[in-house]
């Protein structure tokens, strides 16, 4: 059964033409750290992206073909995520259980700079995607995934990992960016609101989703996570909005059914495997892409970000068990586990499409067209 | 090759102390959280005292805070754990374990701690404490 989605045909949260700077300050959501324009001790720019070496050609996959008869998005409101508040939810929840305070937070100290040293880089993640200041690159082809439609056994691991809820992929994921360019998915993990209030990391044009799904990969080009941290390409990450929309969700029902079983911090349960390319949009070919880095410390960058121009429906049912079942640390709910749009500093942000064309008349200005940078042009 | 090996594990007396040391090899620990974990015999494993390198939070259970210090060396690519005050009670293997740190893994050192089923990145083999008299 495929699921509820919506299909963008002009770009999300519509478009206008602007300046490559960061939001104001109306959108500092559950933020620690200042964006820093200049470039800590020692960390290095980390500017295009740069083909792996050693990596094979991935099996010729299918790209998922575009559906019919959904939904269209022409209207998509372009507002400022109203008064996103400074710090999660503090309830009461059973007994404390805190040590020292310096561990990294959603909002309040300690900065996370301090905490670590490579979240005041210069290419940090999530950003503003502005398409009107999209790059269109028509090198960019539609994402290939292979192996991601898993059999209800072995089992996986769900965990309340303390800031998140998070899903251990099994070996044999497989996803290509492109040519040479091959990841292997290890874990999901999403980011959410709180009640009336949106959690997506990534915004459009100022606006933020209710949440957003993170499925990440390993190039193939490294044996481990650790050796891939901080080099250029190293990590991908596949994200989409959630959005609310009139249906549930199949296939997210079965890991957001499962989440009392891992309502306390550090809690895991097992689930059965499940179609994991179903959690994501249909529309493989409709992207923006750029490089930044880890949403949460250590912030390595180098990390390649995917955003799909499509999002992924979920009923208000399902928003609100995601925002309002997990506790994290400190006794409190875990929701609002979202950073701060950081600054570009100079990133051109590139799409799979034409997402600067927009007959709207909301584009009044002149587009200002940015130059393709991507990999293989 | 990428281990975990603990050591230092022995015989003790109520009261006394132990070191134990956990060495990583063929990797760094830098983007890793680290915890101690115990288990008794007939009892689940549990997790004793951990650690992130990332943003130097520590996090001890109840039944061992002010008696165990976990820390680590950087240079020797190490984890000690100081256990003082040793009770009967305190009898375990003693393992040793790392997963990455932040969105990629575990993102709190408690949560590291409630790891009770080997599905962290690395576990060690573990080293044997007794206390008796």
């Known amino acids: 059964q495929r699921l509820p989605r919506m299909q963008e045909d002009s770009p999300l949260g519509g478009g206008s033409s602007g300046e490559d700077d960061p939001l104001g300050e109306e959108d500092l959501p559950s933020e620690e750290d200042s964006p820093r324009e200049e470039d800590p001790p020692g960390e290095e720019d980390l500017p295009g992206e740069e083909d792996l070496p050693g990596e094979e050609d991935l099996p010729e996959v299918k790209p998922k073909s575009e559906e019919e008869g959904s939904l269209k998005l022409e209207d998509l409101p372009t507002v400022e995520a109203p008064g996103d508040p400074q710090e999660p939810q503090n309830n009461a929840h059973r007994d404390k259980e805190g040590d020292d305070q310096s561990h990294w937070r959603y909002g309040g100290d300690p900065p996370w700079p301090r905490v670590s040293p490579a979240c005041a880089g210069r290419f940090q993640s999530p950003v503003d995607i502005r398409p009107q200041l999209a790059a269109f690159c028509p090198a960019l082809r539609p994402l290939e995934l292979l192996g991601f439609q898993l059999p209800p056994l072995p089992e996986l691991r769900l965990r309340n990992n303390g800031h998140s809820v998070q899903l251990t992929l099994p070996p044999g994921l497989e996803m290509a960016l492109g040519p040479g360019r091959e990841y292997r998915a290890l874990q999901l993990h999403l980011h959410w609101g709180a009640a009336g209030r949106p959690g997506s990391e990534h915004t459009v044009e100022g606006h933020r989703f209710p949440a957003e799904i993170h499925v990440v990969h390993l190039s193939t080009a490294f044996a481990r996570v650790d050796e891939a941290l901080g080099r250029p390409g190293g990590l991908a990450v596949l994200a989409a909005f959630l959005e609310e929309g009139p249906e549930e969700n199949s296939a997210y029902e079965q890991l957001l059914s499962r989440l009392e079983e891992i309502a306390e911090e550090g809690s895991e349960t097992q689930v059965p495997g499940l179609d994991i390319s179903a959690l994501l949009p249909s529309d493989f070919s409709r992207y923006f892409q750029y490089e930044g880095s880890l949403t949460t410390p250590p912030c390595a960058q180098g990390v390649i970000w995917t955003v799909f121009n499509q999002t992924v429906m979920l009923s208000a049912k399902q928003l609100h068990t995601l925002s309002d079942t997990l506790w994290g640390p400190g006794d409190s709910r875990l929701q609002l586990n979202f950073r701060a749009t950081q600054p570009l500093n100079g990133r051109v942000i590139e799409a799979s499409f034409p997402a600067g064309v927009d007959s709207s008349p909301r584009a009044a200005e002149p587009v200002q067209l940015n130059s393709c940078l991507a990999a293989g042009d | 090759q990428v281990k975990l090996e603990e050591s230092g594990g022995d015989l003790v007396q109520p009261g006394g102390s132990l070191r134990l040391s956990c060495a990583a090899s063929?990797?760094?620990?830098?983007?890793?959280?680290i915890g101690w974990f115990r288990q008794a015999p007939g009892k689940e494993r549990e997790g004793v005292s951990c650690f992130s390198s990332v943003d130097g939070s520590t996090y001890y259970a109840d039944s061992v805070k002010g008696r165990f210090t976990i820390s680590r060396d950087n240079a020797k690519n190490m984890v000690y754990l100081q256990m003082n005050s040793l009770k009967p009670e305190d009898t375990a293997i003693y393992y040793c374990?790392?997963?990455?740190?932040?969105?990629?893994?575990?993102?709190?050192?408690?949560?590291?701690?409630?790891?009770?089923?080997?599905?962290?990145?690395?576990w060690g083999q573990g080293t044997q404490v007794t206390v008796s008299s």
């Open positions: 374990a790392a997963e990455l740190y932040g969105e990629l893994g575990v993102a709190t050192v408690q949560a590291m701690c409630r790891l009770t089923t080997p599905g962290g990145d690395y």
């Open positions: 063929g990797f760094t620990l830098d983007y890793y959280a």
